[in-house]
């Protein structure tokens, strides 16, 4: 049999061979399709069918606009001159090439030494399904499941049938000071179809800096509670990956497990002290925030003892 | 909202003539096989006509072949049948119906014309 | 030429029975055939197309079913405005065919 690829919605016409070009034939073309269960005997004076394959003059068979139903086997049996039976056989398959890929969300940047998204490629409208690549400088990238992490997603249009295809490309870039180019490609995997690239994207690596800052927020705002209170204390860090955070209480480290939040419920008179948080980050040597003071009282005075935050709530490192 | 009205329906002598027009709206007329349908007084629906999309392909049951042709004209979004020598058999109502091929099979009808032949 | 044989060609129901009515078709006809409603003085109104599927705006008590060459149309419940005659038509070969009709009555 002979292997046919025509593009979804074209024309295709499928030769009967042997067949004499001209009435009176002796022919049958029979299909079996995503159309049919079994095998579907063409009516030679043509039919309800002929919207999907007809019967030409010469013996041929016409798919005016070939659909993903339409994939299948199609088979042809005639009689030529010399009264030998001649058969033809065709294996159809549907392809559709999508819109050029595109990468959405692109990072503007990259941190080295910390997972870093760089972007989402996105192809749609492809069948078969097909793959999507991702090229660093030019080269395959291969994931690991380590510095390089890809994420893929395929969905099918419940009524085109045509595909949309997804892939997240996370990496951890070795060292800063770098300008990679990333690029993606759609591929249908067809022969003689070349790949769909997008546009590159060139991201600027930079060494991981330290935290902006650390703050230090409390609830109640100044600190000030009640006995049998609760108070929550908050350490926000802008860092990524977010780094361990142990807390400090009057100097000395608190035995706790490292939280970014410390709550002190039903406090007491035991729970009063400066209180301060510890991030450490990897990359970078711990960095303490500025402290707090928290005081149980019963009166419930007004404004923040001498040395507690203002009136937000939380300090802030320069 | 697709619409399918017939005109042209009426009485004839056997022997005569007759010229049913559909004109369709709401729906690309081009894309679509038609289909003339007809139904006797009291009786069943009988297949009439089908034409392709194109218009370069016709079909009819033996019951009308060499006497009836459908036709269409897709810039008017118009369907047409021609009836020459009518019968007395031949009295229905005719109904127009969008479709005719496997893809789409008479999603949507006229109201009907009726045609009465007698002398 | 395939022969679509209808049965039954009227029966007589009640609001609330469930209708079954058959279409058996003289040869295969794969998943070709649909299901019309008409009411008298009425257009047919497709109900179900390629044998199993409901045609939109159609109720879900309606619903159509196949076994080789054997077509069913049931109706789960029968309301007050069920009451009219139902045609199969096969499409899969020309000439075109419907079935005789099956006209639902109430009791």
């Known amino acids: 049999g002979q292997n046919i690829t025509a593009r979804i919605g074209e024309p295709l016409v499928l030769s009967c061979k042997g067949a004499p070009k001209k009435p009176p034939q002796q022919l049958e073309w029979k299909l079996n399709t995503g159309r049919t269960e079994a095998w579907k005997v063409l009516s030679p004076q043509g039919g309800p069918w002929d919207s999907v394959a007809r019967i030409l003059p010469n013996g041929s068979l016409l798919l005016p606009a070939t659909g993903i139903v339409d994939e299948g086997t199609f088979r042809c049996r005639a009689t030529n001159r010399r009264g030998k039976e001649v058969k033809s056989n065709y294996r159809v398959r549907v392809y559709q090439i999508p819109g050029k890929p595109e990468i959405v969300d692109p990072a503007s940047e990259l941190t080295a030494s910390v997972p870093n998204k760089v972007g989402t490629c996105v192809s749609e409208g492809s069948y078969p399904a097909g793959t999507l690549s991702w090229h660093l400088d030019g080269k395959l990238l291969i994931p690991d499941g380590k510095e390089t992490l890809v994420k893929e997603e395929t969905r099918r249009h419940p009524e085109t049938g045509l595909f949309t295809l997804r892939s997240e490309l996370t990496v951890i870039p070795t060292q800063g000071g770098t300008h990679p180019t990333f690029s993606c490609s759609f591929s249908l995997g067809l022969p003689r179809r070349r790949p769909l690239n997008t546009a590159p994207i060139q991201l600027r690596v930079r060494e991981p800096g330290p935290p902006e800052g650390i703050q230090l927020l409390v609830e109640p705002e100044g600190g000030i509670v009640a006995p049998g209170g609760t108070v929550t204390l908050t350490c926000a860090i802008s860092a990524q990956p977010p780094p361990q955070v142990h807390w400090i209480k009057d100097g000395a480290p608190l035995p706790l497990a490292p939280s970014p939040v410390l709550l002190l419920p039903e406090v007491g008179h035991e729970d009063e002290g400066t209180y301060s948080c510890v991030a450490t980050h990897p990359s970078h040597g711990p960095q303490e925030s500025p402290p707090v003071s928290i005081r149980v009282t019963e009166t419930g005075d007004e404004g923040p003892a001498e040395g507690s935050v203002g009136e937000s709530g939380l300090g802030t490192l320069a | 909202e697709v619409q399918l009205v017939e005109s042209g329906g009426g009485l004839v002598q056997p022997g005569g003539s007759l010229r049913l027009s559909c004109a369709a709206s709401g729906f690309t007329f081009n894309n679509y096989w038609m289909t003339w349908v007809r139904q006797a007084p009291g009786k069943g629906l009988e297949w009439v006509a089908s034409i392709d999309n194109s218009g370069d392909n016709t079909y009819y049951p033996d019951s009308v072949k060499d006497r009836f042709t459908i036709s269409r004209d897709n810039a008017k979004n118009s369907l047409y049948l021609q009836m020459n020598s009518l019968r007395a058999e031949d009295t229905a109502v005719y109904y127009c119906?969008?479709?005719?091929?496997?893809?789409?099979?008479?999603?949507?009808w006229g109201q009907g014309t009726l045609v009465t032949v007698s002398s | 030429d395939i022969q679509m044989t209808q049965s039954p060609s009227s029966l007589s129901a009640s609001v609330g029975d469930r209708v079954t009515i058959t279409c058996r078709a003289s040869q295969d006809v794969g998943i070709y055939v649909n299901w019309f409603q008409q009411k008298p003085g009425k257009a047919p109104r497709r109900l179900i197309y390629?044998?199993?599927n409901l045609a939109d705006g159609v109720p879900s008590r309606f619903s159509g079913s196949r076994s080789g060459t054997d077509f069913t149309l049931t109706i789960s419940s029968l309301q007050p405005e069920d009451f009219a005659t139902y045609y199969c038509?096969?499409?899969?070969?020309?000439?075109?065919?419907f079935g005789g009709g099956t006209k639902v009555e109430i009791k």
């Open positions: 390629r044998a199993t």
């Open positions: 119906a969008r479709g005719g091929d496997i893809k789409v099979s008479l999603d949507r």
């Open positions: 038509l096969e499409f899969d070969e020309h000439p075109l065919t």
